[in-house]
Amino acid sequence: ESALITQQDLAPQQRAAPQQKRSSPSEGLCPPGHHISEDGRDCISCKYGQDYSTHWNDLLFCLRCTRCDSGEVELSPCTTTRNTVCQCEEGTFREEDSPEMCRKCRTGCPRGMVKVGDCTPWSDIECVHKESGTKHSGEVPAVEETVTSSPGTPASPCSLSG
């Protein structure tokens, strides 16, 4: 389980830094792209490419920009109002249940099944039974049952749903 964000995980602001613009809080909050000063009197801008805030806030620190992992490509860079957007490289995908890593897509479907959905950065290939059209969510079957397979492809559970 992940630990909560601590102040070490956030990018502290050098309050005297001349490049950081200041403005006054509105109703005790600072706008996207800013955080509030410790005395609550100023809104201090986040540093482009280093940290960000996406909504009105009373944060003492902007949030540190995400760095894309190896195996990911950067779709859009971090700005003061939006975190970096990372996406799995071609041929890999990220499941919602295990968002911490990109996994290799299978290269083919089990025998008796046909591919109806391609590998995307968000999902493995989708296979259905030829006859029934029942979905198969990604079990890698025994080697002799595999139409095409790639070594090192991690197994994931199979759930047949009507």
Epitope: E1, S2, A3, L4, I5, T6, Q7, D9, L10, H35, I36, T54, H55, N57, D58, L59, L60, F61, L63, T66, N83, P99, E100
Partner: nanobody
Framework: EVQLLESGGGEVQPGGSLRLSCAAS????????MGWFRQAPGKEREFVSA????????YYAESVKGRFTISRDDAKSTLYLQMSSLRAEDTAVYYC??????????????????WGQGTLVTVKP
């Protein structure tokens, strides 16, 4: 598994106040990101507010800025939303949300792993 139970909704006049509570059970929420979304009749769910990190600050949608205040009591596994200066456009079902990964606040519905059943807030004269 985390179960969420919201309470505190009801009918209130414009300008009135309500305090919503969200009690979490199943496990401690101290290591979880939490927040509130709402869904007005015929509209999509929208972000309201999020607790960004423990003992830290919070995020608010522009539409509720200065009127709503989010807070949490990890010892009681409870999230709160104090709503004041309520308007007719605040009428909605309010949902408490929790995410297993707290590195970033929950500002989109996709980031939430668990949802409460919702509590209805109606603002009318």
């Amino acid at each position: 598994e985390v179960q969420l139970l919201e309470s505190g909704g009801g009918e209130v006049q414009p300008g009135g106040s309500l305090r919503l509570s969200c009690a979490a059970s199943g496990r401690s929420i101290s290591n979880y990101a939490m927040g509130w979304f709402r869904q007005a009749p015929g509209k999509e769910r929208e972000f309201v507010s999020a607790s960004v990190w423990n003992q830290g600050g919070n995020y608010y949608a522009e539409s509720v800025k200065g009127r709503f205040t989010i807070s949490r009591d990890d010892a009681k596994s409870t999230l709160y939303l104090q709503m004041s200066s309520l308007r007719a456009e605040d009428t909605a079902v309010y949902y408490c949300v929790v995410a297993r990964t707290p590195e970033t606040p929950i500002t989109s519905a996709r980031g939430a792993n668990y949802w409460g059943q919702g509590t209805l807030v109606t603002v009318k004269p």
